[in-house]
Amino acid sequence: EPPTACREKQYLINSQCCSLCQPGQKLVSDCTEFTETECLPCGESEFLDTWNRETHCHQHKYCDPNLGLRVQQKGTSETDTICTCEEGWHCTSEACESCVLHRSCSPGFGVKQIATGVSDTICEPCPVGFFSNVSSAFEKCHPWTSCETKDLVVQQAGTNKTDVVCGPQDRLR
């Protein structure tokens, strides 16, 4: 694509190239043959994050605590506010407009990856030799107890939801 009539950081208006406003500023008036582009800084709680010819700055995002949101990074005149979720919650979308409670892994499943402010808990089924008997957002699958190391024998086999039950070895008479 060949270059356009105006250079980078310029825009074409009424047969002339005007300078764009820098990030953090909005357009007040276009340049003329005799005057430069006039720009003004964005107000409190406003921002523009690109070289622009916008006549209004964007409002910073509001992190609504009623939706489980809190401020992760305060906005500036050049950046939007970044929201994240309260402890135990995660964002429902990349834009993080609302939060949902982290899911718990049911008995028979363990936590593969603990949830963050932006991603949910990832569960995995407990493989043979492991179990989880609780619904939890933190607990991994636990290995079955090794009866042998305790000089005991398996009295009841373990499942993905229950540990093995160990008991004393039968004595020879």
Partner: antibody, heavy 116, light 107 residues
């Protein structure tokens, strides 16, 4: 005094090309855009495109993309409009104009007649 | 593309008359509206740029006004040399577009 002097009238056959020149004087050639406009017989004005003579950047009207080519030679303060694959319907007066706030100064126009 | 609708397409007036030509854009053009005068065999002349700014050398009987989509060119007292065709043109959004013209004739 700002002046834009265009090349003389042209008669072309369908399918041929034409290159019109527009020589600027009386101002800094690279400081202003050059616009090109078409006026068909008895009709209104139609914008073709614009060139920045400083570095050759262009914008075209979609309608003329592929048929019109704008260029400029800084060393002789001259802008050019080339039209290819001419048709009878391309018969018109072609104007160059200097930008600024609007089309501030115009050339006298170049009549291109396309006829077999 | 932005459509520019000029009215009237022609008018007859006498020397000394006040003449008004209007131009309506199909969308807001933020005052980037220019007026031109064309006479047969002569170079086109810019009269007014950016709605109301008189181009250098243009007599003060010419004036422009308007905003948004509606714009007006006024000649306060028509002179013999003002008989010509007038065009409006928007410079807000590519492609630049022109009104179809208003021919001002002698009554």
């Amino acid at each position: 005094e700002v002046q834009l002097v265009q090349s003389g009238a042209e008669v072309k056959k369908p399918g041929e090309s034409v290159k019109i020149s527009c020589k600027a004087s009386g101002y800094g050639f690279t400081n202003y855009l050059i616009e090109w406009v078409r006026q068909m017989p008895g009709k209104g004005l139609e914008w073709i495109g614009v060139i920045n003579p400083g570095y050759g950047g262009v914008n075209y009207n979609e309608k003329f993309k592929g048929q019109a080519t704008l260029s400029a030679d800084k060393s002789i303060s001259t802008a050019y409009l080339q039209l290819s694959s001419l048709k009878a319907s391309d018969t018109a007066v072609y104007f160059c104009a200097r930008g600024g706030s609007g089309f501030a100064f115009w050339g006298q126009g170049t009549l291109v007649t396309v006829s077999s | 593309d932005i459509q520019m609708t000029q009215s009237p397409s022609s008018l007859s007036a006498s020397v000394g008359d006040r003449v008004t030509i209007t131009c309506r854009a199909s969308q807001d053009i933020s005052n980037h509206l220019n007026w031109y005068q064309q006479k047969p065999g002569k170079a086109v002349k810019l009269l007014i740029s950016s709605t109301s700014r008189l181009h250098s050398g243009v007599p003060s009987r010419f004036s422009g006004s308007g905003s948004g989509t509606d714009y007006t060119l006024t000649i306060s007292s028509l002179q013999p040399e003002d008989f010509a065709t007038y065009f409006c043109q928007q410079g807000n959004t590519l492609p630049w577009t022109f009104g179809q013209g208003t021919k001002v004739e002698i009554k």
